[in-house]
């Protein structure tokens, strides 16, 4: 299996944005790569977003996706937006080398993303 590395812990910003790098130990320069972000919480795994990209090109997620990303060599910089406290969980990076063959699959150990909902601003009198 292909080795995939990602940070153990990331804290989302007060605006509910979390970014992390997913790096894969490619055996060579794949021309087509698929990156999937999975969320594991309470022993359930759900797909957050996925993108297939050609090496040298930008990642393209679906228009309604909460993910954006850029690639550089064998690194993918992923950003997940719109996170709330209830979205806290383990976010796993899955990388597939789709072309040329043979197919390679790598799954990271996951990044624990902590999301803290911002405190509502108290009314202030001037």
């Amino acid at each position: 299996a292909m080795h995939v590395a990602q940070p153990a812990v990331v804290l989302a910003s007060s605006r509910g944005i979390a970014s992390f790098v997913c790096e894969y130990a490619s055996p060579g320069k794949a021309t087509e790569v698929r990156v999937t972000v999975l969320r594991q919480a309470d022993s359930q795994v759900t797909e957050v977003c996925a993108a297939t990209y050609m090496m040298g090109n930008e990642l393209t997620f679906l228009d309604d996706s909460i993910c954006t990303g850029t690639s550089s060599g064998n690194q993918v910089n992923l950003t997940i937006q719109g996170l709330r406290a209830m979205d806290t969980g383990l976010y796993i990076c899955k990388v597939e080398l789709m072309y040329p063959p043979p197919y390679y699959l790598g799954i990271g150990n996951g990044t624990q993303i902590y999301v803290i909902d911002p405190e509502p601003c108290p009314d202030s009198d001037f």
Partner: antibody, heavy 118, light 107 residues
């Protein structure tokens, strides 16, 4: 696990064509990967000659391109190298090796020594 | 083509000591660098790929680092079986190229 084995004449006369074959076992050539030839002159470093792909595509080192031809025989699960108009500088150990496209070489043959001499 | 320059050409180290081998690329190759070990009469054996990842079965005393144009192979505590020739290899750009090798010998 994949194994590669080179074969061919150990002695070639100057101006003739060097012909080598690499037999692959434990993996079907047509399933993927790229199949390479690399050589090592006596006491020197490694020189990549080129590859032939699982799909028949190829790329040769520009320094040797005019003299190199590679082919693949999927029915015999082997690939071959032909190097024409050889001279003494082509004397080397010739290795066949496997890699992922533009990748490192994860499997090598044991190498076969070719001497160019009259 | 990309030229890979290894230094030193020969390195003399005592068993149990640390060995550091250098490889410089003539242009940026990202992290697409591998290292091989070759013993007399044998084919090269992959040690490290993608700059820092050990090939399967390679002991933890072998480690790789670097990016761009400068790369290092470190052997933390030399064993008798580690004395050999080491080659770096770039697979960022065709034609694929190798360094000229560093001979690691017993001091």
């Amino acid at each position: 696990q994949v194994q590669l084995q080179e074969s061919g004449p150990g002695l070639v006369k100057p101006s003739q064509t060097l012909s080598l074959t690499c037999a692959v076992s434990g993996y079907s050539i047509s399933s993927g990967y790229y199949w390479n030839w690399i050589r090592q002159p006596p006491g020197k470093g490694l020189e990549w000659i080129g590859y032939i792909g699982y799909d028949g595509s190829n790329y040769y080192n520009p320094s040797l391109k005019s003299r190199v031809t590679m082919s693949v025989d999927t029915s015999k699960n082997q690939f071959s190298l032909k190097l024409s108009s050889v001279t003494a500088v082509d004397t080397a150990v010739y290795y066949c090796a496997r890699n992922y496209y533009s990748g490192y070489f994860d499997s090598w043959g044991q190498g076969t020594t070719v001497t160019v001499s009259s | 083509e990309i030229v890979m320059t290894q230094s030193p050409a020969t390195l003399s180290v005592s068993p149990g000591e640390r060995a550091t081998l250098s490889c410089k690329a003539s242009q940026n190759v990202g992290t697409y660098v591998a290292w091989y070990q070759q013993k007399p009469g044998q084919a090269p054996r992959p040690l490290i790929y993608s700059t820092s990842y050990r090939y399967s079965g390679i002991p933890a005393r072998f480690s790789g680092s670097g990016s761009g144009t400068e790369f290092t192979l470190t052997i933390s505590s030399l064993q008798s079986e580690d004395f050999a020739v080491y080659f770096c290899h770039q697979y960022d750009t065709y034609p694929l190229t190798f360094g000229q090798g560093t001979k690691l010998e017993i001091k």
